[in-house]
């Protein structure tokens, strides 16, 4: 019962985590304009992995996709790759774990096969979570570096009265969503791995031997049990599950109305 609960909870936690990773990847607010000296600004900039946006006081928001692939910073490409790998692995992990759930019966699938699949999905969730955490952390590091660089350059060339204040960017909501989601996926994966250990069936072989003694008919049944972890090569019904990620081309999004100043 505890094993089923652990497996089920691991699945749910991972599901929430992967949904969060997908949400974070799609979000536009990976970096937001730092309002260091102007808490309310007439023009507010924020950027995502796929496009950058500008929100005006008028309420209009204009977003532009990054239509170049080669012109983008290598770090941004790396973050994109990490997040997509995380999503793909997480999606495959979810698919595998659905079939591995103890509460779901599929044909004559053995417990050893379910244990294997639970472990596989658990590992996939762990790697998926790590990919998301790594991606978000790389982006955060990039922001911190750029933040201090732009701070150092902020008031350069101020010989005259003309100031050119550089726009500095700080952590956006997507980073926090990504960190939490990656952590949840990781926790879910660990729970699946723990559940896997308890899922391993305990095979009890009863070898009945009859001993005929004079005047008595007593049957002795010495019992021995063989514990199988299900990690061996004796696993039957092995299935390989495929998952794929579909990406859509970014399109120019025309200015839309926002509900805040």
């Amino acid at each position: 019962m505890a094993v089923t609960a652990c497996q089920g909870l691991g699945f749910v936690v991972s599901l929430i985590g992967i949904a969060g990773i997908i949400a974070a990847t799609c979000m536009d607010q990976w970096s937001t304009q730092d309002l260091y000296n102007n808490p309310v600004t007439a023009v507010f900039n924020y950027q995502g992995l796929w496009r950058s946006c500008v929100r005006e006081s008028s309420g209009f928001t204009e977003c532009r996709g990054y239509f170049t692939l080669l012109g983008l910073p290598a770090m941004l490409q790396a973050v994109r790759a990490l997040m997509i790998v995380g999503i793909v692995l997480g999606a495959i992990g979810l698919l595998v774990s659905i079939f591995a759930l103890k509460c779901i019966r599929i044909g004559s699938m053995e417990d050893s096969a379910k244990a294997n699949m639970t472990l596989t999905s658990g590992i996939m969730f762990i790697v998926s979570g790590l990919c998301a955490i790594a991606g978000v952390s790389v982006f955060a590091n990039m922001l911190v570096t750029n933040f201090w660089m732009s701070t150092a350059n902020m008031y350069t060339g101020m010989g005259g009265m003309v100031q050119t204040v550089q726009t500095r960017y700080t952590f956006g909501a997507a980073l926090f969503v990504g960190w939490v989601a990656g952590g949840l996926t990781l926790i879910g994966g660990v729970m699946m791995c723990i559940a896997c250990r308890g899922l391993a069936p305990e095979e009890t072989n009863y070898k009945a031997v009859s001993y005929h003694a004079s005047g008595h008919s007593v049957a002795y049944k010495p019992g021995g049990f063989k514990a199988s972890t299900g990690f061996g090569s004796n696993t039957k019904n092995k299935k390989i599950y495929d998952g794929g990620a579909r990406t859509e081309d970014e399109v120019q999004s025309y200015p839309s109305k926002h509900d805040y100043v």
């Epitope: 007439a42 023009v43 924020y46 006081s57 008028s58 309420g59 209009f60 726009t167 109305k257 805040y260």
Partner: antibody
Framework: EVQLQQSGAEVKKPGASVKVSCKAS????????MNWVKQAPGQGLEWIGL????????SYNQKFQGKATLTVDKSSSTAYMELSRLRSEDSAVYYC???????????WGAGTTVTVPS | DIVMTQSPDSLAVSLGERATMSCKSS????????????LTWYQQKPGQPPKLLIY???TRESGVPDRFSGSGSGTDFTLTISSVQAEDVAVYYC?????????FGAGTKLELK
């Protein structure tokens, strides 16, 4: 057709308050930010502040903080600006203006003249 | 606050002539996020409210004659009327739309010679 209809001219004693209205028609009132601009006689334009009719969010020019209070009534598609503790230097024409792309004010009311005798 | 400085204070041109007025800001009005300059030009005739001519420094408002054009980037901007008409006699204001408080220039008065 977009129209911003402002209330009539007001003559107020020093220390009094005045509430200027701006009724919007011909567009979605909650979809556009409303600005208020002051123009003293023979002077240039001075931005007072803005209000988002959707959520009531405001931004003020520090100079008018405490002097002007911006509100909206969504049901009647009307924006209001209340000026308190009136002084002779508050005598001016006050315009309401709708904000559009580029934070530009594309439609303006005809203006409300507020006179505060010294 | 961003200070907007317009020049000249007044400008007298003959009908059909070209009129050029300048507007300088104390800070750059170029937004790095969309590479747009948040500068607006208005025309105000006596006894009337201002009328929007140009936004984003160079985008003409619909219904505005094409003799009006805006140019410039960063801190230096120009409004040009290619062929002045009698109805163009007015005061022209530039405005910072980039940073609060939104600020206007003192205006340039266009007159006919």
């Amino acid at each position: 057709e977009v129209q911003l209809q402002q209330s009539g001219a007001e003559v107020k004693k020093p220390g009094a308050s005045v509430k200027v209205s701006c009724k919007a028609s011909g567009y979605s009132f909650t979809g556009y930010t409303m600005n208020w601009v002051k123009q003293a006689p023979g002077q240039g334009l001075e931005w007072i502040g803005l209000i988002n009719p959707y959520n009531g969010g405001t931004s003020y020019n520090q100079k008018f903080q405490g002097k002007a209070t911006l509100t909206v009534d969504k049901s009647s598609s009307t924006a209001y600006m209340e000026l308190s503790r009136l002084r002779s230097e508050d005598s001016a024409v006050y315009y309401c203006a709708r904000m559009n792309y580029g934070n530009a004010m594309d439609y303006w009311g005809a203006g409300t003249t507020v006179t505060v005798p010294s | 606050d961003i200070v907007m400085t317009q020049s000249p204070d007044s400008l007298a041109v003959s009908l059909g002539e070209r009129a050029t007025m300048s507007c300088k800001s104390s800070q750059s009005l170029l937004n790095s996020g969309n590479q747009k300059n948040y500068l607006t030009w208005y025309q105000q005739k006596p006894g009337q409210p201002p009328k929007l001519l140009i936004y984003w420094a160079s985008t003409r408002e619909s219904g505005v004659p094409d003799r009006f054009s805006g140019s410039g980037s960063g801190t230096d901007f120009t409004l040009t009327i290619s062929s002045v008409q009698a109805e163009d006699v007015a005061v022209y204001y530039c405005q910072n739309d980039y940073s609060y408080p939104l600020t206007f220039g003192a205006g340039t008065k266009l007159e006919l010679k």
